[in-house]
Structure formats: C-alpha cells, structure tokens
C-alpha cells in the first residue's frame, strides 16, 4: 500500500508497458528523461546516505524503538538541522515497489513534545509536529496489453501522482480545545 | 533571476516551441499532462489562498516589514501550524515568469530566534531556520527554431529542474556557543 501521508492526486498515462521494456525497478525511460532526474529530489537523494549508515526501513510505526534524545549543546555544534532542532527528527527509508522512486527518505519526529533548551529534556508543554511537502512520483499498476479485462502478467501502466511526504518537524504550541 | 534557494539541477528537453504553441504563461501541454498537475504541489496550491488574502509578493528581503509575533493564548487554540510554531513563518508568493509554475508560495521565518514558551517573547538562545525541500519545475529559455545561434523571438525551450524551496521553519540550538 502507498504511504498514507495525505490523499494522493494522480494523472494516468495511457500506455501499457511489458516487462521487457522496463529495467528492474525502473519507470519507462521516456517518463524519466522528460523530467529532471528524481535522485535530485531530497527525499530520494538522502536514501543512499541513509542506506550507507544502516538506517531503518519501511513501515515501523512512528517512534517505534526510538526515544526523544537529550540535547546537549556541546554535541550539536556541528550537527545537522534535524539533530539540532528542539523538535528533532530522523529519516526513515520508505520502500514501495509499485512506486518510482521505490525508496524515499521520510522524516519522523523523535519526540511527542519538544526539547527544553535549558534542561535538554523533553517538555510536554510543546508538541513536535511533522511538516509535510508534496512530492511527484510515478505509480505503477498491472494492465492488459491485449485489450481484455485481465491484466497481462509483468505488464504495467504508470501514472504520476503527488504524495505528501514528511520532510521535517517543527515545535508548536499545543492546540487543544473543548 | 531564479530564486537562490539552492543549486538547481536540470535536464533539458529537445524541442523549441513557438509562441503559438504555448498558452499564456503555460508550459507545453504534453509536459503538463505527462506529469501530475502542478497545482497539487503545496507551494503551488497555497498561492490561490495567499492571493485571496492579499499576501506579499516577490523579492522583498526576509523579515522585511515584519516582526516576531506572539500568538495570544486564545489564538493558539485554532491557529495553523505556521502560526503555532515557536519558530513561526509566513508564506510569500515568489513569481518567476520563466518558470512553470510561475508562482510559488515560499516560507519565510518571522523570527531570528524562537518564541520562549514561558514568556511568550523571542529568545536569542535559539534560532529559527528554514526547512528546504526540492520541487520539480519547468524552466524556459529563448531558443532558435531555425538552427541558427540567435534565439527566435517568442520561442522557448524548456527543461525540468529541481529547485530548493523553503517550506517551513524549525527551532534549533545555535551552532555557536558564543
């Protein structure tokens, strides 16, 4: 199933591609060359470095096996934004074989609250929330090459789609009302 | 000039389009229908609502004519993320006639520091920083339809490009201990 980051909006392409026309895990070449190379998109570009450092994969729930870190100023002098933030996040690799790119780096907030800058510890008086952004992807689904209702094995049609991807976290005043 | 949000990466398309082939301010139809509709991307989708409420345009500098706000306790109850954040931001419409989409909503941090949750005032002990994200756009440039070196008036070639767009702000510990 595609990630449920927001309701996707799509536009279908018309052609049904055979397995021979598609490289392993790739989208149709003309769709790739008509647009910029996807690996330049941040959620894609991050994947290689995450894999190199052995980051977690796929659909473990948010905060699964993680804890809100204690922020020590001396340790974050050279750290990246996602580690220096008082609503820190990490990146997880989300994999979907029916999507191109198959792998995306998505942000997960590490804390429910935010980190108190004085103590370095989490405070529940503030909330960490995800910042979502749209990303253009291709989605494939089985199709028929002979005009029948039944899909032809190994054949796929593609449509482009915007999905909502969490790209980071921000610290907010909580919104509770009666 | 294109916005300087990060080094763009591009891929050129081959065809040189005449003015007659292009609707006003639009990209070539086949490039638009091959991909999802751009208006579904958040930086594009926000433009209409920003224009409806009379938001600022174009290249005024960051923080021009703004001040770091304090959200009243009763306003916190129903405000959006960008207002409830302790590193609040607003959206500005960036316009570039040689880009499709021509108008994008980009985030600008309203504070240099962050809002202190105890006092409701800005504190310099923390910094607001932009969160950048990649967005796929089309860029047009003059081209020659007759094979000469000189561009044909009103004719354009298009290439797709990823640009880095600020989508929000997060509150971080400063890099310097000074």
């Amino acid at each position: 199933d595609p990630p449920s980051w927001g309701k996707p909006r799509s536009h279908r392409t018309l052609r049904c591609y055979s397995a021979e026309e598609l490289s392993h895990g790739q989208a149709p070449p003309h769709l790739l060359t008509r647009s910029a190379r996807w690996e330049q998109a941040l959620p894609v570009a991050l994947v290689a470095s995450l894999e190199a450092t052995g980051h977690r994969r796929q659909h473990e729930g948010p905060l699964a096996g993680t804890q809100c870190p204690v922020l020590r100023p001396e340790e974050v002098l050279e750290a990246d934004t996602h580690e220096r933030s008082i609503s820190p996040w990490r990146y997880r690799i989300d994999t979907d074989e029916n999507r191109y790119p198959q792998k995306l780096a998505v942000a997960e907030c590490l804390c429910r609250g935010c980190i108190n800058a004085k103590t370095g510890r989490e405070t529940a008086a503030l909330n960490s929330v995800q910042l979502l952004q749209s990303l253009l992807v291709l989605r494939r689904q089985p199709c028929s090459r002979d005009g029948t209702a039944d899909p032809t094995p190994g054949s796929f049609a593609f449509h482009t789609e915007f999905i909502r991807v969490p790209v980071g976290c921000t610290c907010v005043l909580p919104r509770s009302t009666q | 000039d294109p916005p300087s949000w990060g080094k763009p990466r591009s891929h050129r398309t081959l065809r040189c389009y005449s003015a007659e082939e292009l609707s006003h301010g639009q990209a070539p139809p086949h490039l638009l229908t091959r991909s999802a509709r751009w208006e579904q991307a958040l930086p594009v989708a926000l433009v209409a609502s920003l224009e409806a409420t009379g938001h600022r345009r174009q290249h005024e500098g960051p923080l021009a004519g703004t001040q770091c706000p304090v959200l009243r306790p009763e306003e916190v109850l129903e405000a959006d993320t960008h207002e409830r954040s302790i590193s609040p931001w607003r959206y500005r419409i960036d316009t570039d006639e040689n880009r499709y989409p021509q108008k994008l909503a980009v985030a600008e941090c309203l504070c240099r520091g962050c809002i202190n949750a105890k006092t409701g005032r800005e504190t310099a002990a923390l910094n607001s920083v932009q969160l950048l994200q990649s967005l796929l756009v089309l860029r047009r440039q003059p081209c020659s339809r007759d094979g000469t070196a000189d561009p044909t008036p009103g004719s354009f070639a298009f290439h797709t490009e990823f640009i880095r767009v600020p989508v929000g702000c997060t509150c971080v510990l400063p890099r310097s201990t000074q």
Epitope: G113, T123, A124, A125, N127, L173, P174, R175, S176, T177, Q178 | V70, L71, R72, P73, E74, V76, L77, E78, A117, K118, T119, G120, R121
Partner: antibody
Framework: QVQLVESGGGLVKPGGSLRLSCAAS????????ISWIRQAPGKGLEWVSY????????YYAESVKGRFTISRDNAKNSLYLQMNSLRAEDTAVYYC?????????????WGQGTLVTVSS | QSALTQPASVSGSPGQSITISCTGT?????????VSWYQQHPGKAPKLMIY???KRPSGVSNRFSGSKSGNTASLTISGLQAEDEADYYC???????????FGGGTKLTVLG
C-alpha cells in the same frame, strides 16, 4: 522569596466598583503572564483574566467581559484588576497567579487572596 | 458545570494510596499531557502540585504523581499523611470562551 500579595478587597454594593492590586517580588515580574483567578465561598476555582508580560495583550472570561479590566505596571512590579458594575455573583476570594508557561494553566505562584463581597 | 469532572470526595487511611480522577474530552485532557493539579488547604491559596501531566515542581513530595489514560488524568498520593487532607483541583486548557478550566474539586479526607 518569590511572592504575590493581593490587596484592595472589601464590601461593595451591587453596581459598584473596586480596584484590586497585586504586588510581586522575588522574580522578574516583566517576564511572566499573570492571571486573576477567583473562588466563590465554598465553591471551586474560576479563571477570570490574563495579561501578557508586556501588558499589551489581555483576555477575559465571558462572565466578566466588559466589566473588568486587567492592567499592570512592570516598573512597579504591580498587577491590577479594575472591577465595575459588580454583581452578587462576583463575590469571591480573588487570587493573582503567575503562569509558568504563557499559554497554559500552570499557575506556579499564587497570592494569598483578597476577599470581595458584593452585597446590598 | 465544569468542563473537567472530578469526584466530589475521596478518603483514605494514613499510609494508603489514593487516586483522584479528572475526566475531560478527547480534545483537552485526551489530546495532550497538559493537565495541572493544585492542592488547597482551608483558608489558604492553591499550590501547584503537578504540571505537564506528571511533573512535580521543586519542593513537592515525590508521594504525589500524575498520569493520564485516554481522556482521564489522575493524581495519585501514596503513603497518605494527615497533612494531605485538602481540596484538590485539576486544570486544563479550555475554549475561547473560558480559556482555562478547573475541575470542580475533590475533597480528600485522611481517616483516623
């Protein structure tokens, strides 16, 4: 030490006015939002109003809106509540209380209270 | 009518533990760990005992603890002592009409 001390309570007729004061000491008064909270005899606590640290922002419970005015003088470390058009149901002990987070009901320092009685 | 519901009274013997509940809705108590608890002895001002649902201000005994389950916040007092006899109030965010709401209060009686 950190403390708030209320004054100005007393007996007043319905329709009358009264001005309560709250003197702060032992902390940086101008850094904190302050609220007035009241307690009718034998009843529970009821939030009445807040004022921001600078004094530029105020807010009132519906029950007192238009009749009560909260203000502060940071130079004097003082908070005030001007109460007009008083009613019998305004009879209560009035407390000033410091908010430890400006947008949350965490009142970490309270005054001893001052009794306001509205009766003919 | 308070937006936060507390039992009118609870009692316990010295040394025992008691729990006072504070029930709200999914959008106040249920959404965030933002409940605070106050102790009030007769004729005295309230005193903050718990904030952020479970944190104790300095000077408050560790016999007092706060927790939350669903839409209900709870204050637990262990090793009950005579001086714990008092009224206890919970508080949370309210609405634009009443910004901060208190529970109706619970009278704690220490028996014997």
């Amino acid at each position: 030490q950190v403390q708030l001390v209320e004054s100005g309570g007393g007996l007043v007729k319905p329709g009358g006015s009264l001005r309560l004061s709250c003197a702060a000491s032992g902390f940086t008064f101008s850094d904190h939002y302050i609220s007035w909270i009241r307690q009718a005899p034998g009843k529970g606590l009821e939030w009445v109003s807040y004022i921001s640290s600078s004094g530029s922002t105020t807010y009132y419970a519906e029950s007192v809106k238009g009749r009560f005015t909260i203000s502060r003088d940071n130079a004097k470390n003082s908070l005030y509540l001007q109460m007009n058009s008083l009613r019998a149901e305004d009879t209560a002990v009035y407390y000033c209380a410091r908010q430890s987070y400006y947008f949350l009901p965490y009142f970490d320092v309270w005054g001893q209270g001052t009794l306001v009685t509205v009766s003919s | 009518q308070s937006a936060l519901t507390q039992p009118a009274s609870v009692s316990g013997s010295p040394g025992q533990s008691i729990t006072i509940s504070c029930t709200g809705t999914s959008s106040d108590v249920g959404s965030y760990n933002l409940v605070s608890w106050y102790q009030q002895h007769p004729g005295k001002a309230p005193k903050l005992m718990i904030y952020e649902g479970s944190k104790r201000p300095s000077g408050v005994s560790n016999r007092f603890s706060g927790s939350k389950s669903g839409n209900t916040a709870s204050l637990t007092i262990s090793g009950l002592q005579a001086e714990d006899e008092a009224d206890y109030y919970c508080a949370s965010r309210g609405s634009r009409r009443v910004l901060y709401v208190f529970g109706g209060g619970t009278k704690l009686t220490v028996l014997g």
